[in-house]
């Protein structure tokens, strides 16, 4: 049966959802153990400039040593101001300098990046290395690299659309995901549903995605339920600021006891099936709906407390 | 499977200029560049210059850069190289080679070879 | 330009004997390369960033060496293996190949 619920876009003072991610638009991991240098190429596309971003590496000290040097090749489409955390790492640095502005000195060797388009970017960063790993990101707020981790099976780094960085890369979008809400008809009461879809990506292990719901409501005021669906390898960290009914598919834990695991239930996996879960579990408003790439860490952000769902 | 067909035997005059092709296939043109070789008699190698296929845009080696100039047609998938003002020095084997990045940017396909005969 | 000088020009081996050639740089380099040629047909890579086969070609290759200073060698020479090799270097501009090393069958 239908549900009749005619989703419309919420103005971001109703709800917001920001993510963090390792799916890119273009990517590739690889092992390359034997090599003098670690290079990584960052790809990033701003729709507009100037741009911030937060760039953060990671090392983790192996065998009682830093790792090898590195080499992180920065090409960028339009102006950038960077936040550069690397600290303790031996790390040159290849950017276009008339695009690439620092928020404070660097403290890194610093290569100027020719001038050439993606693929001579490539072969120029090549020619100083095997490639670990390179991605191609759209509109980074930041980005999270973690060196020596590269898990790629493969022991050279081919650019492939829709790749899964794994631990290697995660970063989040400047651009929120679009939150919509809707009233379902014939449903009394003020209940309210967040539901939260996480499509599949493109390698399957287990991956854990935290949650973080942050309702500005006061406690009595909430009747609410959270569902999230997502493919089966995924379980569920919840960090909520209020209590609710927890709908979820895979296992859940919440952060305040997070070795406690909670068997969820098989949901639909669309849109209509959700909205017709919501309407089962008696909400009257679905305050947020988000469907997002496989992600590590989703944060909602909401106001919506059971009254009038607003949509812009 | 990734194939470059380069164009056949050319026997010219001195002083005259000729235009040898390289058409690709088997992959995707704008994700490698294409570079031409020339090995002589003495059967060395030597880079000559490369091209993207994306812009168009061009790298030589200083000592070809007014013997040769490379081009391209992506509606076809073909890369141009044309030698002018040809001496027998000239006379040589010329190949294309596409550059794979993920194998160090080395030359991981070569085209069978265009002979090149200056000679009066 | 950074010349790669290869040695020996010309060398001959039995079956199943150890072969070695080298390759020296005038200017240190991180890497080379290795390519095969046979008569009368294109060059194939051999060996990419100094020690990594490329694909099809057999376990008796091996490359190796740092610097100046790098070298092939088939740990057991078959009669398929009989051709010239290349090395070249990326790193210094213009790109250069060695002057070859020609292996013959014994």
């Known amino acids: 049966e239908t549900v009749h619920c005619d989703l419309q876009p919420v103005g971001p003072e109703r709800g917001e959802v920001t993510y963090t991610t390792s799916q890119v638009s273009k990517g590739c991991v690889a092992q390359a153990p034997n090599a003098i240098l670690e290079v990584h190429v960052l790809f990033l596309e701003f729709p507009t400039g100037p741009s911030q971003l937060e760039l953060t590496l990671q090392a983790s000290k192996q065998n009682g040593t830093w790792p090898r040097e590195v080499l992180l090749v920065l090409s960028v489409n339009s102006s950038v101001f960077l936040h550069l955390q690397a600290l303790g790492i031996p790390l040159h640095l290849a950017y276009n300098s008339s695009l690439v502005t620092f928020q404070e000195p660097p403290g890194v060797n610093t290569t100027e990046l020719p001038s050439f388009p993606k693929t001579q970017i490539l072969e120029w960063a090549a020619e100083r290395g095997p490639i670990t790993s390179a991605a191609e990101l759209n509109d980074p707020q930041s980005i999270l690299l973690r060196l020596g981790q590269a898990q790629g099976s493969l022991s050279f780094c081919m650019l492939e659309a829709s790749q899964d960085m794994g631990r290697t890369l995660e970063w989040r979008p400047r651009t929120p995901a679009l939150v919509r809400g809707c009233h379902l008809e014939g449903v009394a009461g003020h209940k309210e549903a967040h539901i939260l879809r996480v499509l599949p990506g493109h390698s399957a292990g287990p991956r854990t995605v935290t949650v973080k719901v942050e309702l500005s409501c006061a406690p009595g005021d909430l009747d609410a339920v959270l569902i999230l669906q997502g493919p089966p390898y995924v379980s569920w960290l919840i960090d909520a600021n209020h209590n609710m009914q927890i709908w979820t598919t895979g296992e859940y834990s919440f952060k305040i006891f997070p070795e406690k695991n909670i068997r969820g239930f098989k949901l639909p996996d669309t849109p209509q099936g959700l909205l017709g879960e919501a309407r089962m579990l008696n909400a009257s408003i679905v305050a947020s709906f988000v469907e997002l790439p496989l992600a590590s860490i989703v944060s909602l952000h909401a106001s919506s407390c059971g009254g009038r769902l607003q949509t812009s | 499977e990734v194939q470059l067909e380069q164009s056949g035997p050319e026997v010219v005059k001195p002083g005259t200029s000729v235009k040898i092709s390289c058409k690709t296939s088997?992959?995707?043109?704008?994700?490698?560049?294409l570079h031409w070789i020339k090995q002589n008699q003495g059967k060395s190698l030597e880079w000559i210059g490369g091209?993207?296929?994306?812009?168009?845009?061009?790298t030589y080696r200083q000592k070809f850069k007014d013997k040769a100039t490379l081009t391209v047609d992506k509606s076809s998938s073909t890369a141009f190289m044309e030698l002018r003002s040809l001496t027998s020095d000239d006379s040589a084997v010329y190949f294309c080679?596409?550059?794979?990045?993920?194998?160090?940017?080395?030359?991981?396909?070569w085209g069978q070879g265009t002979t090149l005969t200056v000679s009066s | 330009e950074n010349v790669l000088t290869q040695s020996p020009a010309i060398m001959s081996a039995s079956l199943g004997e150890k072969v070695t050639m080298t390759c020296r740089a005038s200017?240190?380099?991180?890497?080379v390369y290795w390519y095969q040629q046979k008569s009368d047909a294109s060059p194939k890579l051999w060996i990419y960033y100094t020690s990594n086969l490329a694909p099809g070609v057999p376990a008796r290759f091996s490359g190796s060496g740092s610097g100046n200073s790098y070298s092939l060698t088939i740990s057991s020479m078959e009669g398929e293996d009989a051709a010239t090799y290349y090395c070249q270097q990326f790193i210094s501009f213009p790109y250069t190949f060695g002057g070859g090393t020609k292996l013959e069958i014994k």
């Open positions: 080679a596409r550059r794979a990045y993920y194998y160090g940017s080395a030359f991981d396909y």
């Open positions: 088997g992959y995707t043109i704008t994700e490698h560049t």
């Open positions: 200017s240190s380099v991180n890497y």
């Open positions: 091209i993207n296929f994306d812009n168009g845009g061009t």
